[in-house]
């Protein structure tokens, strides 16, 4: 789903004080609902008719450091009979996402909110049928 | 997919610079890839073997202020008869994900970090079998 | 854009052969495949033949195995249906179909027909 532009409305101060110094803001510490977890079904990349595999990118300039991608294994699904069937397709599930830029000259170290497309999982779907002149 | 634990690291300074004042970073304004778009085939969510339904949250103290819950349609997934096969389950993809909670007393304004758990979709899996003694 | 020409298709004898070809242009992606429909008006599409594009996996209906043959040429984006001993149950339109996942695009078909 589709994260709206910001119009930087949201990190402005209300318009009867004094606007924010530098073009910079306070980031508190700490992270809200840091503790919750995701609690999926087990395993279900491989036990889905449209399996996926992953693959984990690494930056320590960013956070989260670890972003997984999601690939579709196969363009059809599988069937009953484990088969992969091609009037079928698996379409990948994407999400828009917020990570943090970490950004250090020496000692000066800044934050910057950065979007990130993620590939979540895959699902299998009835491709929609397009006629072509 | 999980988000780890900051463990405050991350937001840290080199150890040979001077800590950061008042448990606060500097997060600058902008963000970046802000007009990267997510680009899924259309209506997946009603063309899925596991459909699914998306509820809006709205706040407008975070950011983004819009979050998109999906919730599956069914417990089994829908067959090529467009019946619904109990003998497979549609299960929920859910994803860790960042937004940023705004807190203003007066003219003090600050952001913090919050972990979101978002279900993105579902997919159609076979159920794993438990054997109850 | 998509863009899908057809060729090959005609008046056969039972027992005969006949060669369908398809040329695919416009945004290809990895995980896409190209194949071949057909219709007998007032009867459900069936699949008759599929290539990966990548992996150059076939896909067969059972009622072709073993007759039909389809192929592809990578460098131009071209496939092939070779349909051998044909059957009057052959006779349909045959669609040439490029599949991009979640997309089906379908060109605008070419007669195929099997006397007795």
């Known amino acids: 789903r589709k994260i709206p532009k910001v119009g930087h409305t949201f990190f402005q101060k209300p318009e009867s004080c004094p606007p924010v110094p530098g073009g910079s803001m306070k980031l508190d510490i700490g992270i809200i609902n840091e503790n919750q977890r995701v609690s999926m079904s087990r395993n279900i990349e491989s036990r889905s008719t449209s399996p996926w595999n992953y693959t984990v990118t690494w930056d320590p300039n960013r956070y989260p450091s670890e972003v997984v991608q999601a690939q579709c294994r196969n363009l059809g699904c599988i069937n009953a009979q484990g088969k992969e069937d091609i009037s079928m397709n698996s379409v990948p599930i994407q999400q828009e996402t917020l990570v943090v830029r970490r950004k250090h000259q020496g000692c000066s170290v800044s934050f910057q909110l950065e979007k990130v497309l993620v590939t979540v999982g895959c699902t299998c779907v009835t491709p929609v049928i397009h006629h072509v002149q | 997919r999980k988000i780890p634990k900051v463990g405050h690291t991350f937001f840290q300074k080199p150890e040979s610079c001077p800590p950061v004042p008042g448990g606060s970073m500097k997060l600058d304004i902008g963000i970046i890839n802000e007009n990267q778009r997510v680009s899924m085939s259309r209506n997946i969510e009603s063309r899925s073997t596991s459909p699914w339904n998306y509820t809006v949250t709205w706040d407008p103290n975070r950011y983004p202020s819009e979050v998109v819950q999906a919730q599956c349609r069914n417990l089994g997934c829908i067959n090529a008869q467009g019946k619904e096969d109990i003998s497979m389950n549609s299960v929920p993809i859910q994803q860790e994900t960042l937004v940023v909670r705004r807190k203003h007393q007066g003219c003090s304004v600050s952001f913090q970090l919050e972990k979101v758990l978002v279900t993105v979709g579902c997919t159609c899996v076979t159920p794993v079998i438990h054997h109850v003694q | 854009q998509v863009q899908l020409v057809e060729s090959g298709g005609g008046l056969v004898r039972t027992g005969g052969s006949l060669r369908l070809s398809c040329s695919v242009s416009?945004?290809?992606?990895?995980?896409?495949?190209m194949g071949w429909y057909r219709q007998v008006p007032g009867r459900q599409r069936e699949l008759v033949a599929m290539?990966?594009?990548?992996?150059?996996?076939?896909y067969y209906a059972d009622s072709v195995k073993g007759r039909f043959t389809i192929s592809r040429i990578n460098a131009n984006n071209t496939i092939y249906l070779q349909m051998n001993n044909l059957k009057p149950e052959d006779t349909a339109i045959y669609y040439c179909?490029?599949?991009?996942?979640?997309?089906?695009?379908m060109g605008q078909g070419t007669l195929v027909t099997v006397s007795s």
């Open positions: 416009g945004d290809i992606s990895s995980q896409s495949a």
């Open positions: 290539i990966h594009t990548t992996k150059g996996d076939t």
């Open positions: 179909t490029h599949n991009e996942p979640g997309d089906l695009y």
